[in-house]
Interface confidence: low
């Protein structure tokens, strides 16, 4: 339906609190460098304007689109040219080009560093003094670091953050209560950000069809009792919601997500038996709960897949009449029967099935041609299965840190041109697949691992796209979304790589290393390992083990010394010389 004033419509639907939060997120995701106070001022102005439009929808400018209104407001920022350079040129454009321009300038790696949590008492004082400001600051800090964060979900995490402080600021030992809860929330937020980034990349780089295929597979696994038509409706709505959020239309996105949650809860009987608990919750929690809900049980007596997709004499007729719908039903039927498969694997099987029908339906005897199509799936299923088995065994043998280092070596040898910080970040994330998935029951490992790896490799693709340095990375990232992981897995050592010149600077360490938290200490060591490999790409596992062992001893020795800085200055060059000799 058309509304006289779009901004009034969204304000009424969302309510002031959520409206304010979403506008703050939108501004923070677009203007990532601006101070919090500047954003608060803009949000207040937009909110007051919206209230005016609610009171009188025919008031001046109330008929303008949200992009026009929010874009005009962004373009009033005085420091735009100084802080953002050419992004200021976006303001010369008219909508919709202006919004597209802003989107292109979003920075996936703004370099603000991890959000540091100040001391517990200070946090609780700030929380009690001005709860709204405290939570607004949280939204701002997350949004500017994660410019594609799923906005309505970020509002949910802000509520969870509020809950943590409400509880812990009353506790006897505030820090003991806060630290584990804030850390656990940080992990969830980072995971949520990375997942949404993959959804946005899928929509932006591979189109709506790719996103819908992914969603059909995922929802069919979660809601195997739902009919195909029901799944299709949910997928269409979901595609609209994520297109909006990925496109910066956060108010529409949040409003549509709330509508979808309402629809799902009103139609639980035809979707899933597991939704009752979710549907009693308030809107943000309800949507979050639905997105995380456990899988429903499979309906009894499902016929074998072959009946409709191999044995039916009408296979080619059905396929040629409505290719997307027929392939959609194949993906739906296969996915609901295989909750243990990763979405990526299910999509590869659907692609293989499509390729077989394309080939066979053009022959004289199609049924004979596609009779054994399911046998052609075996290697596609075995490849990720073996990969997960091998890597989980390696993880169990080495532990998380050792497993990360093995992956660092593997990926640096595959794509040595990639920057050291990116290789370290991505390999550390890849290495977390062990503790995240290898501890699962056998039946859940594959889907957990491969779908998690897709999310992590998307991060590599996003970072690499910003500063492309490797044709191999570009190829794996752009050729096929579902084959990204197999593409990276298949990469061998890059024999064309010219080793990096040795630089003593890279291997110079100081006493500040000793006071770093464990994770940051690991990052320093892992960065040194990457640099070592870039200098000596042919180094053997044994040589690397020796050098890294020596490095660990060197750090331990100097951090235990009376005069730490003197020790680093004296022992550092010796270590470098020894390392060069060991790798000669």
């Amino acid at each position: 339906e058309a509304h006289q004033s779009e901004i009034a419509h969204r304000f009424n639907d969302l309510g002031e609190e959520h409206f304010r939060g979403l506008v703050l997120v939108a501004f923070s995701q677009y203007l990532q460098q601006c101070p919090f106070e500047d954003h608060v001022k803009l949000v207040n102005e937009v909110t007051e304007f919206a209230k005016g439009c609610v009171a009188d929808q025919s008031a001046a400018n109330c008929e303008k689109s949200l992009h026009e209104l929010l874009g005009d407001k962004l373009c009033t920022v005085a420091s735009l040219r100084d802080k953002y350079g050419e992004m200021a040129d976006c303001c010369e454009k008219k909508e919709p080009e202006r919004n597209e321009c802003f989107l292109q300038h979003k920075d996936d790696n703004p370099g603000f560093g991890q959000l540091v949590t100040p001391e517990a008492d200070a946090m609780c004082t700030a929380f009690h003094e001005n709860e709204q400001r405290f939570l607004g600051k949280y939204l701002y800090e997350i949004a500017r670091r994660h410019p594609y964060f799923y906005a309505p979900e970020l509002l949910y995490y802000a509520e969870e953050y509020k809950g943590v402080f409400t509880e812990c600021c009353e506790a006897a030992d505030k820090a003991a209560c806060l630290t584990p809860k804030v850390d656990a929330l940080r992990e969830k937020v980072l995971a949520s950000s990375a997942k949404e980034r993959l959804k946005c990349a899928s929509l932006q780089k591979f189109g709506e069809r790719a996103f819908k295929a992914w969603s059909v597979a995922r929802l069919s696994q979660k809601f195997p009792k739902a009919e195909f038509a029901e799944i299709s409706k949910l997928v269409t709505d979901l595609a609209k919601i994520h297109k909006e959020c990925c496109h910066g239309d956060l108010l529409e996105c949040a409003d549509d997500r709330a509508d979808l949650a309402k629809y799902i809860c009103e139609n639980q009987d035809s979707i899933s038996t597991k939704l009752k608990e979710c549907c009693g919750k308030p809107v943000l929690e309800k949507s979050h709960c639905i997105s995380e809900v456990e899988r429903d049980e499979l309906p009894a007596d499902l016929p074998p897949l072959a009946v409709d997709f191999v044995e039916d004499k009408e296979v080619c007729k059905n396929y040629q009449e409505a290719k997307d719908v027929f392939l959609g039903t194949f993906l739906y039927e296969y996915s609901r029967r295989h909750p243990e498969y990763s979405v990526s694997l299910l999509l590869r099987l659907a692609k293989e099935y499509e390729a077989t029908l394309e080939k066979c339906c053009a022959t004289d005897d199609p049924p004979a041609c596609y009779a054994h199509v399911f046998d052609e799936f075996k290697p596609l299923v075995e490849e990720p299965h073996n990969l997960v088995k091998t890597n989980c065994e390696l993880f169990e043998k080495l532990g998380e840190y050792g497993f990360q280092n093995a992956l660092l070596v593997r990926y640096t040898k595959k794509v040595p041109q990639v920057s050291t910080p990116t290789l370290v970040e991505v390999s550390r994330s890849l290495g977390k697949v062990g503790s995240k998935c290898c501890t699962h029951p056998e039946a859940e490992r594959l889907s957990c691992a491969e779908d998690y790896l897709s999310v992590v490799l998307n991060r590599l693709c996003v970072l690499h796209e910003k500063t492309p340095v490797s044709e191999r990375v570009t190829k794996c990232c752009t050729e096929s979304l579902v084959n990204r992981r197999p593409c990276f897995s298949a990469l061998q050592v890059d024999e064309t790589y010219v080793p990096k010149e040795f630089s003593a600077e890279t291997f110079t360490f100081h006493a500040d290393l000793c006071t770093l938290p464990e994770a940051e200490k690991q990052i320093k060591k892992q960065s040194a390992l990457v640099e070592l490999l870039k200098h000596k790409p042919k180094a053997t596992e044994e040589q690397l083990k020796t050098v890294m062992g020596d490095f660990g001893s060197f750090v331990d020795k100097c951090c235990a010394a009376e005069d730490k800085e003197a020790c680093f200055a004296e022992e550092g060059p010796k270590l470098v010389a020894a390392a060069q000799a060991a790798l000669a």
């Epitope: 656990a184 969830k188 608990e277 979710c278 995380e292 456990e294 029951p441």
Partner: nanobody
Framework: QVQLQESGGRLVQAEDSLRLSCAAS????????MGWFRQAPGKEREFVAA????????DYVDSVKGRFFISRDIAKSTVYLQMNNLKPEDTAVYYC?????????????????????WGQGTQVTVSS
């Protein structure tokens, strides 16, 4: 009401591996966080490891991190504790425990306290 039955405990040498199992029966297993605890002679019962109701998040006491792995098989209503590189100080009676899930999210952490249901225990002895 949930009934829990541990098995798999025995006498092993230091550095050996052992896998403990805990079979659950009764109320729906899927809606419970599961944990392993242990009690050495003359000491208080201590938390070892826990896994949340969906098997997605785990928690370990520092002394067993990297050596022990907790997992669950929802279809078989069983939780496992894979113990590698055992040490004499791991000698204890190991108890399996269950508690109502701590959160609606499958990523909600399992927690170390508030367990309502307990098994009888299984003895693990590690000799040097």
């Amino acid at each position: 009401q949930v009934q829990l039955q541990e098995s798999g405990g025995r006498l092993v040498q230091a550095e050996d591996s052992l896998r403990l199992s805990c079979a659950a029966s009764g109320r729906t297993f899927v809606s419970y966080d599961m944990g392993w605890f242990r009690q050495a002679p003359g000491k208080e019962r201590e938390f070892v490891a826990a896994i949340n109701w969906r098997g997605y998040t785990t928690d370990y006491v520092d002394s067993v991190k990297g050596r022990f792995f907790i997992s669950r098989d929802i279809a078989k209503s069983t939780v496992y504790l894979q113990m590698n590189n055992l040490k004499p100080e791991d000698t204890a009676v190991y108890y399996c425990a269950a508690r109502q899930m701590s959160g609606s999210s499958r990523y909600s952490p399992p927690g170390r306290v508030g367990y309502d249901f307990w098994g009888q225990g299984t003895q693990v002895t590690v000799s040097s």
